[in-house]
C-alpha cells in the first residue's frame, strides 16, 4: 500500500498582504501526476475554487483580480491524482489592508525624544476597534500587536518605549482591526517620524525573530521595551 500523496505547496504572488482593490495570484504546486487542483477557504463552502493544472501539470493558478474583504482569510489547497486526493497544503493566510479608515498615530510627549528617555506612540481610531498594530516602516512585520481583552473595544492603544535608544528612531505607522477577522486591517496611518537625539545610549533592543509568510525585507522588527500598555489591552509579540 502506497503512503499518502505528498502535500502541495501554497503561496501567493506578489505576497500574502494585499491592499484593497489590488490583484493577487494564489499558486498551488503539486506533482506532475495531478489532474485537478482544489482551493479551500476556511469558513467557506468547499471547494472554494477548482482549477485544471497548468502544463506540465505540477501547479495551478487561482487568480483574484481585485482584492476585497471576501477574499481575506485562510486557505489550503489539494490536488487529485489517479490514486486520489493529496494531503492538504500548509495554510496560506491572505490579509487585506484598507478595510477600515486610517487611524491617527502620534507621539507623547513629542516625536523628538532624547536617548534614554521614554516615549509613547499613541494609535487612535475614529471608531472603536479591538486590535492595534504598530509598524516600523521597511520592517516586514508588526512590532507590537495590542488586542483588547474580552472583545472590549477601544478608540486607542498606547505603545510605550523606554528607555529609547537610537534604534527606535525611524518612521512608524499603525493599523487597527476588529478581532473577528485579523485578516482585515485598516488603511495605514500617516507616517510618524520618531527622532532620537543625544548620546545617552542604553542597551540596544535585540531584534525579535520574524517569521515571514509574505517574504519580508531583511530589516527585522525591533521590540520596544516598556511598561504595561493601555489598560484593557494585552500585548502580543509578533
Amino acid at each position: 500500500q502506497a503512503g499518502p500523496l505528498p502535500k502541495p505547496t501554497l503561496w501567493a504572488e506578489p505576497g500574502s498582504v494585499i491592499s484593497w482593490g489590488n490583484s493577487v495570484t494564489i499558486w498551488c504546486q503539486g506533482t506532475l501526476e495531478a489532474r485537478e487542483y482544489r482551493l479551500d477557504k476556511e469558513e467557506s463552502p468547499a471547494p472554494w475554487d477548482r482549477q485544471n493544472p497548468l502544463e506540465p501539470k505540477n501547479k495551478a493558478r487561482f487568480s483574484i483580480p481585485s482584492m476585497t474583504e471576501d477574499y481575506a482569510g485562510r486557505y489550503r489547497c489539494y490536488y487529485r491524482s489517479p490514486v486520489g486526493w493529496s494531503q492538504p497544503s500548509d495554510p496560506l493566510e491572505l490579509v487585506m489592508t484598507g478595510a477600515y479608515s486610517k487611524p491617527t498615530l502620534s507621539a507623547l510627549p513629542s516625536p523628538l525624544v532624547t536617548s534614554g528617555k521614554s516615549v509613547t506612540l499613541l494609535c487612535q481610531s475614529r471608531s472603536p476597534m479591538d486590535t492595534f498594530l504598530l509598524i516600523k516602516e521597511r520592517a516586514a512585520h508588526p512590532l507590537l500587536h495590542l488586542r483588547s481583552e474580552h472583545g472590549a473595544q477601544q478608540h486607542q492603544a498606547e505603545f510605550p518605549m523606554s528607555p529609547v535608544t537610537s534604534v527606535h528612531g525611524g518612521t512608524y505607522r499603525c493599523f487597527s482591526s476588529h478581532g473577528f477577522s485579523h485578516y482585515l486591517l485598516s488603511h495605514p496611518s500617516d507616517p510618524l517620524e520618531l527622532i532620537v537625539s543625544g548620546s545617552l545610549e542604553g542597551p540596544r533592543p535585540s531584534p525579535t525573530r520574524s517569521v515571514s509568510t509574505a517574504a519580508g525585507p531583511e530589516d527585522q522588527p525591533l521590540m520596544p521595551t516598556g511598561s504595561v500598555p493601555h489598560s484593557g489591552l494585552r500585548r502580543h509579540w509578533e
Partner: antibody
C-alpha cells in the same frame, strides 16, 4: 548586508546543460523569492524564473521546458539548470532576490543582485 | 501572458531636462511594477518599487507613478550620471516580464 554570488562554468558546449549556483551570504535564503535573469550581449533583461524559499517555482514560458531552479537552504544556495543550450543562450546570467512586503510601502522589486557571470555557448 | 511595452526605446536629453519614460502593461497589474537602472557594464539597480516608492538611497529626482496598465518613470532634472538603460518589470504574477528597455543618453 545580503550579497549574492553566481558561480559556474563560463563555457558550455551546444546541446549540453548549463549549471549555475547562486550563494547567498549575509542573510538567510529562508524567505523571499529568488530569481535568475539573463542578458544576451547588447540586449535587454530576460527573466528566467524564480524559486520561493519553500521550493515552489515559476519559469518563463519561453524557457519552461528546459529550465530547473532548485534551492538548498542548508547551504544558503539556489541553482539554475538550463538544458539543451544553443548559442542563443550565451548571456550574462544574474541571480537576484525579490524583496518582500513592507507595511506602508508595498512589495519590493528585485533589490539585491549578484554581479553576474558570463556564459558562452560554443563548441 | 502580460506584455510590458516601454517607450521610447531610446532618448537623448540635456543635463537639467525633465525626462519621462513610460511603461504599458497589456493587462492590469495593480501597482506591482518596478523600475531598474542599468549603467553600461554594470548590474541592474532597483530604483522604484510598488510603482511609486523610491528605493532607499536613490536620489529624489527619480519618481514613479501609475497603476493598472500605465506607468511612468520621471527624472526631474537629468544629471550626467543618469546615462543608463532603464527597465520596467511587472511582478504581480509569474512570468515577471521586463520591458524591452529605454536607453537614455545626454545630448
Amino acid at each position: 548586508q545580503v550579497q549574492l554570488q553566481e558561480s559556474g562554468p563560463g563555457l558550455v558546449k551546444p546541446s549540453e546543460t548549463l549549471s549555475l549556483t547562486c550563494t547567498v551570504s549575509g542573510g538567510s535564503i529562508s524567505s523571499y523569492f529568488w530569481s535568475w535573469i539573463r542578458q544576451p550581449p547588447g540586449k535587454g533583461l530576460e527573466w528566467i524564473g524564480y524559486i520561493y524559499y519553500s521550493g515552489s517555482t515559476n519559469y518563463n514560458p519561453s524557457l519552461k521546458s528546459r529550465v530547473t531552479i532548485s534551492v538548498d537552504t542548508s547551504k544558503n544556495q539556489f541553482s539554475l539548470k538550463l538544458s539543451s543550450v544553443t548559442a542563443a543562450d550565451t548571456a550574462v546570467y544574474y541571480c537576484a532576490r525579490r524583496g518582500g512586503y513592507s507595511y506602508g510601502y508595498g512589495y519590493y522589486g528585485m533589490d539585491v543582485w549578484g554581479q553576474g557571470t558570463t556564459v558562452t555557448v560554443s563548441s | 501572458d502580460i506584455q510590458m511595452t516601454q517607450s521610447p526605446s531610446s532618448l537623448s536629453a540635456s543635463v537639467g531636462d525633465r525626462v519621462t519614460i513610460t511603461c504599458r502593461a497589456s493587462q492590469g497589474i495593480s501597482n506591482y511594477l518596478a523600475w531598474y537602472q542599468q549603467k553600461p557594464g554594470k548590474v541592474p539597480k532597483l530604483l522604484i518599487y510598488a510603482a511609486s516608492t523610491l528605493q532607499s538611497g536613490v536620489p529624489s529626482r527619480f519618481s514613479g507613478s501609475g497603476s493598472g496598465t500605465d506607468f511612468t518613470l520621471t527624472i526631474s532634472s537629468l544629471q550626467p550620471e543618469d546615462v543608463a538603460t532603464y527597465y520596467c518589470q511587472k511582478y504581480n504574477s509569474a512570468p515577471w516580464t521586463f520591458g524591452q528597455g529605454t536607453k537614455l543618453e545626454i545630448k
